[in-house]
Interface confidence: low
């Protein structure tokens, strides 16, 4: 799998996941969450060649197609297969509210 | 959606269906397929912009990112969404053979 | 991956014209092709594209004396009703895929085809 | 419509010397660096050199060198040679209007 486990300990340059800390008020402007002040979203990235994790069949057309026509424009793409939620802390008013958000981690990548 | 019915029709620098003929022999280098000789296979590509089509809260969450940072390497991805089958015919020997090939044919696409 | 341009010869003021870039190597479904054109000793002036989607733009200058439309090896301008001033050698040229959307050709035009001449003289 | 405008012509290099080429736009480029430089030879098609503002083409040497953003841009031939002796033009790439790319006027390059 194209986890932590792997992509973390290997230097590749094909399609894993990436290291990614989020500062939810410097990286994307939101003052409303009182905690965590960010959080490991993580990201996927890296080239996706002949058969490297690839999710479905057109994608194996798809990276075959590239290898053999490599300036076309047709490629498959590093993207998130796993994904997480995360809990957070905010406030509505005075009264602080638990909240869950769906898929913000993400935990594995494919080539789609 | 992002699919032939929108994306056809508009010019769209944005993530949308684009349309994509694979002729198998001189595409793919398979032979073993008698028919059909090629197919409408489709592919998705075009920009991620906030908001457009996000496939999950991590996708939004990465788009802004994105806007605020726009140098970082940290993007999301036009990616396929809806997949259909495509039937082929081949021959084991003198025997034909009809399958149907899974996730062949991008119907529509998405930011992930 | 090439281009070559044909159907560029002598014609008289309003006598329609079609030019045709015949493609090989890649295919029109996945490429945008442009046509440029170049009048002796002059720059180079951009006509219009037909996108890997079958859209066609021009130029505001171009548009209604040009057409241009595809079919799947060919890319063909039709100069509607020539003038001498349309007289120049034209080139298509493809757009050079960078990354992986089709959109991103950072206006990089290659490979291009050798050109062909029109003349319009009465 | 956006017009190019370039270094008046012609221009005389010293075989060994430096040139310097500018492009301005009437408007941004496109991304701030949808702008390419091409080499022209009498009775030849262009050639491309640079595209995004500042990448070289496969192949072209690294004596060519482009820079700018936004509607001011450059082109340097360094150590020029007598090959370098040609017509260079800049194109632009525009969103939002009809005219989605212009090319300048052309520099003639002498070379002495």
């Known amino acids: 799998a194209l986890d932590a486990a792997y992509c973390f300990r290997n230097v590749q340059d094909n399609c894993c996941l990436r290291p990614l800390y989020i500062d939810f008020k410097r990286d994307l402007g939101w003052k409303w969450i009182h905690e965590p002040k960010g959080y490991n979203a993580n990201f996927c990235a890296g080239a996706c060649p002949y058969l490297w994790s690839s999710d479905t069949q057109h994608t194996k057309v798809l990276s075959l197609y590239n290898t053999i026509n490599p300036e076309a424009s047709a490629s498959p793409c590093c993207v998130s297969q796993d994904l997480e939620p995360l809990t957070i802390l905010y406030y509505i008013g005075n009264t602080p509210k638990i909240e869950q958000l769906s898929n913000m981690i993400v935990k594995s990548c494919k080539c789609s | 959606a992002l699919d032939a019915a929108y994306c056809f029709r508009n010019v769209q620098d944005n993530c949308c269906l684009r349309p994509l003929y694979i002729d198998f022999k001189r595409d793919l280098g398979w032979k073993w397929i008698h028919e059909p000789k090629g197919y409408n296979a489709n592919f998705c590509a075009g920009a991620c912009p906030y908001l457009w089509s996000s496939d999950t809260q991590h996708t939004k969450v990465l788009s802004l990112y994105n806007t605020i940072n726009p140098e970082a390497s940290a993007s999301p991805c036009c990616v396929s969404q809806d997949l259909e089958p495509l039937t082929i015919l081949y021959y084991i020997g003198n025997t034909p053979k009809i399958e149907q090939l899974s996730n062949m044919i991008v119907k529509s696409c998405k930011c992930s | 991956q090439s281009l070559e341009e044909s159907g560029g010869r002598l014609v008289t003021p309003g006598t329609p014209l079609t030019l045709t870039c015949t493609v090989s190597?890649?295919?029109?479904?996945?490429?945008?092709v442009n046509w440029v054109r170049q009048a002796p000793g002059k720059g180079l002036e951009w006509i219009g594209y037909?996108?890997?989607?079958?859209s066609a733009y021009y130029a505001s200058w171009a548009n209604g004396r040009f057409t241009i439309s595809k079919t799947s090896a060919t890319v063909d301008l039709k100069i509607t009703s020539p003038t001498t001033e349309d007289t120049a050698t034209y080139f298509c040229?493809?757009?050079?895929?960078?990354?992986?959307?089709?959109?991103?050709?950072?206006?990089?035009?290659?490979?291009w085809g050798p050109g062909t001449l029109v003349t319009v003289s009465s | 419509a956006a017009v190019l405008t370039q270094t008046p012509s012609p221009v005389s290099a010293a075989v060994g010397g430096t040139v310097s080429i500018s492009c301005q736009s009437s408007?941004?480029?496109?991304?701030?660096?949808?702008l390419s430089w091409f080499q022209q030879k009498p009775g030849q098609p262009p050639k491309l050199l640079i595209y995004?503002?500042?990448t070289l083409t496969s192949g072209v040497p690294s004596r060519f060198k482009g820079s700018g953003s936004g509607t001011q841009f450059t082109l340097t031939i360094s150590d020029v040679q007598c090959d370098d002796a040609a017509t260079y033009y800049c194109?632009?790439?525009?969103?939002?209007?009809?005219?989605?790319?212009?090319f300048g006027g052309g520099t003639e390059v002498v070379v002495k």
């Open positions: 040229a493809r757009h050079m895929q960078v990354g992986g959307a089709p959109t991103g050709s950072m206006a990089a035009f290659d490979p």
């Open positions: 190597g890649f295919s029109l479904s996945s490429y945008t």
């Open positions: 037909i996108s890997y989607g079958g």
């Open positions: 408007q941004s480029v496109y991304n701030n660096n949808y």
């Open positions: 995004g503002a500042s």
């Open positions: 194109a632009g790439g525009y969103s939002g209007s009809s005219d989605k790319y212009a």
